[in-house]
C-alpha cells in the first residue's frame, strides 16, 4: 500500500479510537487531563493528569528503515493497545507526559527513538508521507 | 554536508518589517523541522520559533508570538522569518537551525547568522 | 514556560582541569535537556542530546548527567579549544527554551 494511503486509514483509525478511548474514559471538552490527538505522525490515546503515554513508532518508520528491529509489539489497529508492554528502554518507544499544562512534547523525539537515517531515506519519495 | 545560510538582515526602523530567509542544503529539507534562534549582542540565545517539516504545526517564544510568522518553502529548500512591529528589543543575530525531527526536536546544525538591528 | 537557570555563570580554570557546569529547570523536563558549546564569533556546536547521550566527533572528554530538573556537563580535562560559552536546552516543553549561558575562562 502506498505511505499516503496508509497514513490516511492511520489517522482515520486514530479519530476512531479516540472517540471511542473519550467514551471509554468519560472524557469531554471540559475533562482535566490531555486529550486524545492526532500529532501528524501518530495517534495519542487520551491521558489523566500524571500519566505517561508510550507509543511504538509508526508505520512512517518502517517505510523508511524496513531493516529497523523494534523489540517492542506494534500497539493493536482496534484500539490503543496495552502501553503497559512497552518500556522506554526499548528502540522504537516514544513517550508523552500529561501534564497540567497539557502535552509534553515526544520523548525522544521521533527521530531518536525510531532509527530515522536521513542518508538512508534521499532516494524513494514515492514511499515518503505527505502529510498535507 | 548540512549547510544553512540566513540573509535579510539588516537596520530598520522601531514598528517596521523584515523578512529573513534561511537557504538549506546537504540534506532532505522537506523532512525536517526548522527552527529560529537569536543573539542578542554579547546576550545568550533565545528560542524564537520552530516549524514542522510541513508547514503544518508553528510554535513561537511568548516574547514573539503575534509579531513575527515562521513558515518554509520546502520546493525552494528555503526557511522564512517574517518579523513585524519590530522593536529595540529584536535588535540580534537571527539563526536558523535544522531540527531533528518531524515535528520540533532539538536543534542540531546551525547558520552563521544573519544581523537585525532595530533602530531609530 | 521552562525557565533554565545555570550556574556558575562564569567559571575560571586553567587548562587540564576539570569543568563541572550546572544546569536547572524550573520543571520537570525529564531527559529532553541538550548542551551547546559556542566560541566567540560563531554559531552553537551540539555537544551532548538527552542530557547524557554523546555525539559523534565531540571528544570524550565532554560528558552530561542528570534528569528531571538538575543536570551536569562535565568536562574532564579542560583543553585550550573548551574555553567557551555553554548553554543548556529545553525540548521537552513549548515554548523551548535556552539557559543564559556559563562562560568558561582562562584563570
Known amino acids: 500500500m502506498h505511505s499516503d494511503c496508509i497514513f490516511k486509514k492511520e489517522q482515520a483509525m486514530c479519530l476512531e479510537k479516540i472517540q471511542r478511548a473519550n467514551e471509554l474514559m468519560g472524557f469531554n471538552d471540559s475533562s482535566p487531563g490531555c486529550p486524545g490527538m492526532w500529532d501528524n505522525i501518530t495517534c495519542w490515546k487520551p491521558a489523566h493528569v500524571g500519566e505517561m503515554v508510550l507509543v511504538s513508532c509508526p508505520e512512517l518508520f518502517r517505510i523508511f528503515n524496513p531493516d529497523q528491529v523494534w523489540e517492542t509489539e506494534t500497539i493493536g489497529e482496534s484500539d490503543f493497545g496495552d502501553s503497559n508492554s512497552l518500556d522506554l528502554s526499548d528502540m522504537g518507544v516514544v513517550s508523552r507526559n500529561c501534564t497540567e499544562d497539557g502535552w509534553s512534547e515526544p520523548f525522544p523525539h521521533y527521530f531518536d527513538a525510531c532509527g530515522f537515517d536521513e542518508y538512508e531515506s534521499e532516494t524513494g519519495d514515492q514511499d515518503y508521507y505527505y502529510l498535507s | 554536508q548540512v549547510q544553512l545560510v540566513e540573509s535579510g538582515g539588516g537596520v530598520v526602523q522601531p514598528g517596521r518589517s523584515l523578512r529573513l530567509s534561511c537557504a538549506a542544503s546537504g540534506f532532505t529539507f522537506s523532512r525536517f523541522a526548522m527552527h529560529w534562534v537569536r543573539q542578542a549582542p554579547g546576550k545568550g540565545l533565545e528560542w524564537v520559533a520552530v516549524?514542522?517539516?510541513?508547514?503544518?504545526?508553528?510554535y513561537y517564544a511568548r516574547s514573539v508570538k503575534g509579531r513575527f510568522t515562521i513558515s518554509r518553502d520546502n520546493s525552494k529548500n528555503t526557511l522564512y522569518l517574517q518579523m513585524n512591529s519590530l522593536r529595540a528589543e529584536d535588535t540580534a543575530l537571527f539563526y536558523c537551525?535544522?531540527?531533528?525531527?518531524?515535528?520540533?526536536?532539538?536543534?542540531?546544525?546551525w547558520g552563521q547568522g544573519t544581523l537585525v538591528t532595530v533602530s531609530s | 514556560e521552562i525557565v533554565l537557570t545555570q550556574s556558575p555563570a562564569t567559571l575560571s580554570l586553567s587548562p587540564g582541569e576539570r569543568a563541572t557546569l550546572s544546569c536547572r529547570a524550573s520543571?520537570?523536563?525529564?531527559?529532553?535537556l541538550h548542551w551547546y558549546q559556542q566560541k566567540p564569533g560563531q554559531a552553537p556546536r551540539l555537544l551532548i542530546k538527552?542530557?547524557?547521550q554523546s555525539l559523534s566527533g565531540i571528544p570524550a572528554r565532554f560528558s552530561g548527567s542528570g534528569s528531571g530538573t538538575d543536570f551536569t556537563l562535565t568536562i574532564s580535562s579542560l583543553e585550550p579549544e573548551d574555553f567557551a560559552v555553554y548553554y543548556c536546552?529545553?525540548?521537552?516543553?513549548?515554548?523551548?527554551?535556552f539557559g543564559p549561558g556559563t562562560k568558561v575562562d582562562i584563570k
Open positions: 538527552y542530557a547524557s
Open positions: 537551525a535544522r531540527g531533528y525531527d518531524f515535528l520540533t526536536g532539538y536543534p542540531d546544525y
Open positions: 520543571q520537570s523536563v525529564g531527559r529532553s
Open positions: 536546552h529545553q525540548s521537552s516543553r513549548l515554548p523551548f527554551t
Open positions: 516549524i514542522s517539516y510541513d508547514g503544518g504545526n508553528k
